[in-house]
Interface confidence: low
């Protein structure tokens, strides 16, 4: 177990052009606070994945009012460290997100007026017990300077806070089976630390913080003997040797208290003593209130103003999670039809439609030919959100406005010569060929492969293409 500590040194405009406007004004004074979110490992986790190592909110900073005309200075910061306790081993590599929030002042009865100013993130290696590490991160035009460290809570030591150490009982050496605690050679590796007060004679533990009783003893600290005379012990299977009940599973076995709460047995059940910040039968409810600003991304906090009334965050569209910390990728549902481009604007979804489609979700297929005239006798053909013109002979182009050169495509086969004509083209065929495009050879015996030529035309004459 241990604590990750974060010290914010400054938050203000970064170097370079484009200094940000002050987030506070004479009309709207405000103050800053910070949120840190820690995750184990160096993986590129999404910003919305849970803060598995823990999270913390700072206190509110002093009230700040912008001086008119003055550039935004470094803004006044909250006092103190942000502390994120961790119960298990320190992972050594971790990801962090630090958010700078603005609280607008006023009687916010109807809901919070908080807005996210900047979010920085990074991945770092850090050994517990080491010195403070300094860092500078930029978010847009803002710059955040901070230091951080991880320290173990006694009796844990080591770079991962997994070894338990105690001062030596004897000056020269550690007890039987116990090694010195490097690098603290004056301390010794300690045996497992049972729950405070656990009877050394009648109790033992297999996990730190527990207290399991030897046969014949009961109670949260194994200090209560099981009666062998009246045999009225309220629980446990009967012992064949004594004919009496011996302690079976107790209500505190397995520690039903969450979030570091300690369990004590009561005549009927158990009772959890919760650490500060938690409450509920099993310490399962965070004592954070709306005053602590637990809802992010413009979420609305509702619930009582006192820790006995749990809060709930109402998330704006595009966000979800118990604290509105998760961004919903609403475009992944592919709401835009007909190939429209989806834009998630945060407050709304927008679809940018392809030509020929319209509507909030591009669901309407427009009449592509509506209002589109094809010139020179061309006809409009719809298709796939675009129109095209099928042009009359002798015309071309998108709207049939261009005069076509009918000979440009070399339409006359077998060396025939092409002549442009007001109604199209005429092919003058080379000897031995005939047809509108000179496509048919004339048989050597003088007969054509076609039916007889119309009157007045001999094979080999120019065939006019109508």
């Amino acid at each position: 177990a241990g604590v990750f500590e974060l010290q914010i040194h400054s938050f203000g405009p970064g170097p370079g052009p484009g200094a940000p406007r002050s987030p506070c004004s004479a009309r709207l004074p405000c103050r800053l606070f910070f949120r840190v979110c820690l995750k184990p490992g160096l993986s590129e986790e999404a910003a919305e994945s849970p803060c598995a190592l823990g999270a913390a909110l700072s206190a509110r900073g002093p009230v700040y009012t912008e001086q008119p005309g003055a550039p935004a200075p470094d803004l006044p910061l909250p006092d103190g460290l942000l502390q994120v306790p961790f119960r298990d081993a320190w992972p050594g590599t971790f990801s962090f997100i630090i958010e700078t929030w603005r609280e607008e002042l006023g009687d916010q009865i109807g809901g919070p007026a908080w807005s996210l100013l900047a979010r920085v993130a990074g991945r770092r290696r850090l050994a517990a017990g080491g010195p403070w590490a300094r860092d500078i991160q930029r978010a847009g035009a803002w710059e955040l300077r901070f230091s951080y460290r991880a320290r173990c809570e006694p009796p844990a030591v080591g770079t991962a806070c997994t070894r338990l150490c105690r001062p030596r009982s004897a000056p020269s050496r550690c007890g039987p089976g116990l090694r010195p605690c490097a690098p603290l050679e004056d301390e010794c590796e300690a045996p497992l630390v049972c729950r405070a007060g656990c009877s050394p004679e009648h109790g033992f533990c297999e996990q730190p913080g527990e207290c399991r009783c030897l046969e014949g003893w009961t109670g949260p600290l194994c200090t209560v003997p099981v009666s062998t005379s009246s045999c009225l012990s309220p629980r446990g299977p009967s012992s064949a040797t004594t004919g009496c009940l011996v302690p079976g599973p107790g209500p505190c076995d397995g520690n039903p208290c969450a979030n570091g709460g300690s369990c004590s047995e009561t005549p009927r059940s158990f009772e959890c003593t919760c650490p500060r910040g938690f409450y509920g039968l099993r310490c399962e409810v965070s004592g954070v209130t709306c005053a602590d600003g637990p809802c992010f991304n413009g979420g609305l906090c509702v619930g009582g103003a006192d820790p006995d009334s749990a809060y709930i965050c109402h998330c704006p569209p595009g966000f979800q999670g118990s604290n509105c910390e998760k961004r919903v990728d609403r475009c992944s549902l592919q709401p835009c039809r007909n190939g429209g481009l989806c834009l998630d604007l945060g407050h709304a979804l927008r679809c940018r439609c392809r030509a020929g489609f319209a509507g909030p979700r591009c669901e309407h297929d427009l009449d592509d030919c509506a209002g589109r005239a094809c010139a020179n006798g061309g006809t409009c053909v719809e298709g796939g959100g675009a129109h095209r013109c099928s042009c009359a002979l002798g015309f071309g182009g998108r709207d049939c406005r261009e005069r076509a050169d009918p000979c440009a495509a070399r339409p006359c086969a077998h060396g025939g010569r092409c002549y442009a004509h007001f109604s199209g083209l005429v092919c003058a065929c080379a000897p031995g060929y005939m047809g509108a495009r000179c496509e048919f050879p004339v048989h050597p015996d003088g007969a054509s492969a076609l039916p007889a030529a119309p009157p007045g035309l001999r094979p080999g004459d120019p065939q006019r293409y109508l």
Epitope: E104, G106, D107, Q108, I109, G110, G111, A113, S115, G298, L300, V302, G303, G304, A305, A310, I312, H314, C315, P316, P317, H347
Partner: antibody, heavy 118, light 107 residues
Framework: QVQLQQPGAELVKPGTSVKLSCEAS????????MQWVRQRPGQGLEWIGM????????NYNENFQTKATLTVDKSSSTAYMQLSSLTSEDSAVYYC???????????WGQGTSVTVSS | DIQMTQTTSSLSVSLGDRVTINCSAS??????LNWYQQKPDGTVKLLIY???NLHSGVPSRFSGSGSGTDYSLTISNLEPEDIATYYC?????????FGGGTKLEIK
Amino acid sequence: QVQLQQPGAELVKPGTSVKLSCEASGYTFSNYWMQWVRQRPGQGLEWIGMILPNSDITNYNENFQTKATLTVDKSSSTAYMQLSSLTSEDSAVYYCARQARYSAMDYWGQGTSVTVSS
Amino acid sequence: DIQMTQTTSSLSVSLGDRVTINCSASQGISNYLNWYQQKPDGTVKLLIYYTSNLHSGVPSRFSGSGSGTDYSLTISNLEPEDIATYYCQHYSKFPYTFGGGTKLEIK
């Protein structure tokens, strides 16, 4: 005392827009969310959306996202809802309501009856 | 979206009756439930917030209870001015939704 004043009725043509108003008095307008609720004839209540005047933050029911636009004028302590591309389906009574703690709408306007008809 | 269901759309009642109106949610809403009264002239008033808390100025004959998905509004001694339609509304997540309403009618 807290009051929310809404005009009694609006008659509008299909395809047009209408901007409904809700004038607040008796409390600090900027600090409370203003909610809007629809009630079609003979039907129940439907939540449209909400706006927090001091920051212009809005939250919409997605069913109304393209239909309604919420705005405020802090100088006159008035909330507005614009309804666009009106059809007969939009004929209804539209209420504004102040939201207090626990997301409870503790004070309601009298409602504006919108009739869409050519 | 969470559906709120008021199974009884109308109730025939007598003055002095003890009346219970039920409301069920399609999923747990953690007591995030309010009750409203709508008079025949369209006027809407808040009665109960957060399942069981009486709004200021509301007579003590109104009470609310419930948990999980099932909630109820009770009027212990029905008065003439209580003839109205009653709506439940959840606020456990967006969008807020209302029940379909329960209309009280004199027998």
